[in-house]
């Protein structure tokens, strides 16, 4: 029993960020005369939250009218709570002293915990594109959540991934936390339309997790396959040689025809066709006048895809015998080869 007790009935209070926290406090007596003050934390570094005597505290309102006679309810409300407001709050009775007020009695304290939602997960992939069969790393980051407990999962096209590492920082007590996770993904040729999803579940989200996505179309490079073929044309002494550029991604592609090593024509892929898997096909042709050549002609289709080293496929066109009629394939021999 004491001549005055300061009662803080709530050991802890949990509030969602953005809401209002009510911190309850009553005194058992109004004597001795002196103000009530609220502090966050204890000791010399404590932070003044509210002073009944003086000061301007725009975020704080008193639950009851402290100017009312015999009022012993010194509860306060703190508006627009953020994670930075977390801590232990003490209701402290001061008595008039000479010259300064003297701390008389403190409540036991109320721990304010702030539930803060994690930010939308941001997924980022590698800086440079990678080709199928390579393993690439994706990172996922989310910040500003509290309490610390959080669950993070990775998915590729709805299938949960298992090869990832996650850290929540800081390790110790903090007003809010951040999560950082790195997942490893093996690319396949079919991944142009694939998505990598980072899913974050937290108590503040009420069972509706946040998701961040990355499209593998930003990450993958599918190199083209080349096929050079020859078709006769109606006009005598002319051969149509086509270069089929298949299954490439992204679209950025430049093709150069070489006749016996000399550049004949360069063009950029424009009218491409898209495959179901998101890759592209493109075809280029070269009309070769056989009569203009005495010797065999080596035709090379050279493709530079997405700034990578050129890939080429060659076709030997023998000019010893000229095609006489449409459909005849005797005038040229296809001896294609891939060159890098």
């Amino acid at each position: 029993e004491e001549e005055l007790q300061v009662i803080q009935p709530d050991k802890s209070v949990l509030v969602a960020a953005g809401e209002t926290a009510t911190l309850r406090c009553t005194a058992t007596s109004l004597i001795p005369v002196g103000p009530i003050q609220w502090f966050r934390g204890a000791g010399p570094g404590r932070e003044l939250i509210y002073n009944q005597k003086e000061g301007h505290f725009p975020r704080v309102t008193t639950v009851s009218d402290l100017t009312k006679r015999n009022n012993m309810d010194f509860s306060i409300r703190i508006g627009n709570i953020t994670p930075a407001d977390a801590g232990t709050y003490y209701c402290v009775k001061f008595r008039k002293g000479s010259p300064d007020d003297v701390e008389f009695k403190s409540g036991a304290g109320t721990e304010l915990s702030v539930r803060a939602k994690p930010s939308a997960p941001v997924v980022s992939g590698p800086a440079a594109r990678a080709t199928p069969q390579h393993t690439v790393s994706f990172t996922c980051e989310s910040h500003g959540f509290s309490p610390r407990d959080i669950t993070l999962k990775w998915f590729k096209n709805g299938n949960e991934l298992s090869d990832f590492q996650t850290n929540v920082d800081p390790v110790g007590e903090s007003v809010s936390y951040s999560i950082h996770s790195t997942a490893k993904v093996v690319l396949t040729r079919e991944d142009v339309h694939s998505q990598v999803i980072c899913e974050v579940a937290h108590v503040t989200l009420q069972g509706d997790p946040l998701r961040g996505t990355a499209n593998l179309s930003e990450t993958i490079r599918v190199p083209p396959t080349l096929e050079v073929t020859q078709q006769p044309v109606r006009a005598e002494n002319q051969v149509n040689v086509t270069c089929q550029v298949r299954k490439f991604y992204p679209q950025r592609l430049q093709l150069t025809w070489l006749e016996n090593g000399n550049v004949s024509r360069t063009e950029t892929a424009s009218t491409v066709t898209e495959n179901k898997d998101g890759t592209y096909n493109w075809m280029s042709w070269l009309l070769v006048n056989v009569s203009a050549h005495r010797d065999d002609v080596k035709l090379t289709c050279q493709v530079e895809h997405d700034g990578q080293p050129a890939v080429s496929k060659s076709h030997d066109l023998k000019v010893s015998a000229h095609p006489k009629e449409q459909g005849s394939n005797t005038a040229a021999e296809n001896t294609g080869s891939n060159e890098r």
């Epitope: 004597i31 006679r69 008595r95 003297v102």
Partner: antibody, heavy 114, light 111 residues
């Protein structure tokens, strides 16, 4: 129940120090303050000072240079010392509990005389 | 120091009548919404007995015939109806500012 009892010499010589004890029961001296109040014969009440539960003290400025209030919590006793007494210090001395002065002792009469 | 002036210095009242004692402070004794003025009854040979605290609150065990009112600098103790054993000295006291002070007292006699 709450009780306070004052004790000490009934006669003190001028210029000497008056020493009184207030022995309390029914409450803790760590939880409650104790006041000293005096009443000269046929006159009104005068507050001397208080010792709070935490041991801090506040005194009447008119007596501050001469008065000391202390306590021994383990013995449930509060002490008043008033130095350099004169005949004007002749009075009945009371101890009373807390800032509210809700319980009083019966008082002890001190006469200052040679 | 806050000086408390009580009036009248004495009064005689018949049983069943109303007795009114006033206490005027030299400065306000109000703080934080409350008036730190209290009233005590003292009978001969006895210590003061608390009657009213914080201007208007009845101490436990005190009959409802006693009531207190006022704020700031002007306060009143009312006994209604007066009974024979209410004969005593009545003191107001403030503990809003140091030094805590008492009024000079009012002697109530029963006719």
């Amino acid at each position: 129940q709450v009780q306070l009892q004052e004790s000490g010499p009934g006669l003190v010589k001028p210029s000497q120090t008056l020493s009184l004890t207030c022995t309390v029961s029914g409450f803790s001296l760590t939880g409650y303050g104790v006041n000293w109040i005096r009443q000269p014969p046929g006159k009104g009440l005068e507050w001397i000072g208080i010792i709070w539960g935490d041991g801090s003290t506040d005194y009447n400025s008119a007596l501050k240079s001469r008065v000391t209030i202390s306590k021994d919590t383990s013995k449930n006793q509060v002490f008043l010392k008033l130095s350099s007494v004169t005949a004007d210090d002749t009075a009945r001395y009371y101890c009373a509990r807390a800032g509210k002065m809700d319980y009083w002792g019966q008082g002890t009469t001190v006469t200052v005389s040679s | 120091d806050i000086v408390l002036t009580q009036s009248p210095a004495s009064l005689a009242v018949s049983p069943g009548q109303r007795a009114t004692i006033t206490c005027r402070a030299s400065e306000s004794v109000d703080s934080y919404g409350n008036s730190f003025m209290h009233w005590y009854q003292q009978k001969p040979g006895q210590p003061p007995k608390p009657l009213i605290y914080l201007a208007s609150n009845l101490e436990s065990g005190v009959p409802a015939r006693f009531s207190g009112s006022g704020s700031g600098t002007d306060f009143t103790l009312t006994i209604n109806p007066v009974e024979a054993n209410d004969a005593a000295n009545y003191y107001c006291q403030q503990n809003n500012e140091y030094p805590w002070t008492f009024g000079g007292g009012t002697k109530v006699e029963i006719k």
